[in-house]
Amino acid sequence: EQAPGTAPCSHGSSWSADLDKCMDCASCRARPHSDFCLGCSAAPPAPFRLLWP
């Protein structure tokens, strides 16, 4: 089991202290109150890169 502060959860998931495991961020659309959903919204979107100068 992963402990908080060790290797991060895989992409698209976030650590739940209430469940002691990584949880799929997709479930936050149905149930946004879950504790791990805070971690899902914490990651900033990837920066937009222009393909030309």
Epitope: E1, A17, D18, L19, D20, A30, R31, H33, S34, D35
Partner: antibody, heavy 120, light 108 residues
Framework: EVQLLESGGGLVQPGGSLRLSCAAS????????MIWVRQAPGKGLEWVSY????????HYADSVKGRFTISRDNSKNTLYLQMNSLRAEDTAVYYC?????????????WGQGTLVTVSS | DIQMTQSPSSLSASVGDRVTITCRAS??????LNWYQQKPGKAPKLLIY???SLQSGVPSRFSGSGSGTDFTLTISSLQPEDFATYYC??????????FGQGTKVEIK
């Protein structure tokens, strides 16, 4: 066979303390979230407290916050509820229950309950 | 907090009757609704989870439906052992859960 067995209930005066225990058997205790639920005489079910599998995360109903403490000892397969500053309105049968194995969406096994009576 | 309201509070029925109990949430809880049966002096027993999934070992005469705010527990043909009190429980805000006030099913 999954079993949850509560103990520690009894008669206590207002302002007193009790410690309830819930001994688990028949399953691996450590991966499961657990809760305490109570039922006052002739009344419905009221959620009291939640604890995560490791014991690192706990939550309480407003009615008991600051007075009750939930804990667990995974090496002893036991859940606890320390109840302080007890009031007459805490009189109830207290049940422990096991959360579902993937989430805490539902509670699939319950103990038989232990009666706590707060009276002078 | 999400309030759960069951109706009726009690009902009288005969063996073989079709019985329907409703549970309404004060706001949408998607499908995060469970049903329990409790007999006097006994612990609650899980019947239905996530609105419509039958718990293992529960007879198929029990069924659940609904989503959002309105949910139903149906007993297709009431049996003598079904006389009990039934509770709904929302898990949308888990681990902060709430129960309905209960529906007592009595013998007519």
């Amino acid at each position: 066979e999954v079993q949850l067995l509560e103990s520690g209930g009894g008669l206590v005066q207002p302002g007193g303390s009790l410690r309830l225990s819930c001994a688990a058997s028949g399953f691996t205790f450590s991966p499961y979230p657990m809760i305490w639920v109570r039922q006052a005489p002739g009344k419905g079910l009221e959620w009291v407290s939640y604890i995560s599998p490791s014991g690192g995360s706990t939550h309480y109903a407003d009615s008991v916050k600051g007075r009750f403490t939930i804990s667990r000892d995974n090496s002893k397969n036991t859940l606890y509820l320390q109840m302080n500053s007890l009031r007459a309105e805490d009189t109830a049968v207290y049940y422990c229950a096991r959360g579902g194995d993937t989430y805490f969406d539902y509670f699939d096994y319950w103990g038989q309950g232990t009666l706590v009576t707060v009276s002078s | 907090d999400i309030q759960m309201t069951q109706s009726p509070s009690s009902l009288s029925a005969s063996v073989g009757d079709r019985v329907t109990i409703t549970c309404r949430a004060s706001q949408s809880i998607s499908g995060y609704l469970n049903w329990y049966q409790q007999k006097p002096g006994k612990a609650p027993k899980l019947l239905i989870y996530q609105a419509s999934s039958l718990q293992s070992g529960v007879p198929s005469r029990f069924s659940g439906s609904g989503s959002g705010t309105d949910f139903t527990l149906t007993i297709s043909s009431l049996q003598p052992e079904d006389f009990a009190t039934y509770y709904c429980q929302q898990s949308y805000t888990s681990p902060f859960i709430t129960f309905g006030q209960g529906t007592k099913v009595e013998i007519k």
